[in-house]
Amino acid sequence: ATGEGLQIQIIYFNLETVQVTWNASHYPRSNLSFHYKFSRDEAYDQCTVYILQEGHTSGCLLDAEQQDDILYFSIRNGTHPVFTASRWIFYYLKPSSPKQVSFSWHQDAVTVTCSDLSYRGLLYEVQYRSPFDTEWQSKQENTCNVTIEDLDAEKCYAFRARVKAMEDAYGPDTYPSDWSEVTCWQRGETRDSCPEPRTPPKPKLSK
């Protein structure tokens, strides 16, 4: 939050597009404008692609291919700057979801692969569960080649995958990708779905 009640969120989608959004509770029914630059000595440009919420501006989308520079921005109410800041946008990375996810079964193990993203410092996480698991199990690797062992071929397993930026590389402000679609497998073949995970029975109350 800022001193004037303007809450800012920055997301750098896959090192391609920067999204800056705000929650201007102190400025109801105002169309705040967004002005930005990537060099301190340049003049500000105004946003050309606004995000609207209930008919009012609530964010801006910027093309910023493979940028690791500072974004300088000013959010204004008319000509009055409401909030001015600069951020290293690289630290707000949200990788794209895993693409071309494929499964290779060999007895009681499966290797999940997908297309590696073009930049480094990422973790590829695969989660899986059977109807007997109340929570997802997880395994992650530095490349999108994750082998999960000791599975029961007779059980139906649901799988999903995502990409995370390593904190050691990108700091604490990143976002994990969205999950890939859940896919279900049993005996090495795809299934439309698995039975819902069983919830433990509630104890009966004695009279």
Partner: antibody, heavy 118, light 107 residues
Framework: EVQLLESGGGLVQPGGSLRLSCAAS????????MHWVRQAPGKGLKWVSS????????YYADSVKGRFTISRDNPKNTLYLQMNSLRAEDTAVYYC???????????WGQGTLVTVSS | DIQMTQSPSSLSASVGDRVTITCRAS??????LAWFQQKPGKAPKSLIY???SLQSGVPSKFSGSGSGTDFTLTISSLQPEDFATYYC?????????FGQGTKVEIK
Amino acid sequence: EVQLLESGGGLVQPGGSLRLSCAASGFTFRSSAMHWVRQAPGKGLKWVSSVSGSGAGTYYADSVKGRFTISRDNPKNTLYLQMNSLRAEDTAVYYCVKEGGSRGFDYWGQGTLVTVSS
Amino acid sequence: DIQMTQSPSSLSASVGDRVTITCRASQDISNYLAWFQQKPGKAPKSLIYTASSLQSGVPSKFSGSGSGTDFTLTISSLQPEDFATYYCQQYNLYPPTFGQGTKVEIK
């Protein structure tokens, strides 16, 4: 463990040049923006310069713009500050600092002393 | 550039005292404020970031608060190792700027 080790400081005459180095370890150097901050004897801290992880983006305090150049060699995990046309007022301990996103200037080197005097 | 003003410039306190240092920014910096501790002949050490978050390994006797333009650093019970100079820094808007420092001395 994050470590930043500066070197290259020393005594130099006004108008002279010096190159400071900072050897980094314990984190993914190529992804981290880096900074130089200086402190004149008995004075406070002053930001000098910053560089983005790729080295493409460079930023300078007005007092050093045109005289100092920040750069980095990511394969060698090393940050540099090339200082030209040095002045007496550049005399300070120079610190190499790691950028931590919202965590700010989260790790500092031990510093290297630059003395500009005739 | 954003000016950062710390007060007091120096203070004398005893072991066990509660100490508060304030920092004021010349414009709204959200919560992008850090506090550093520096002992003579040593590098600064980061204590607090985003106004109130403790850096890893920093003891909980240090706390920070504030947002916008007014911030405080509190040491709940001063110990001998806490006698040092403390700096605030804004990193909301480039160039990053530091306060002039507050020297905490033994009474």
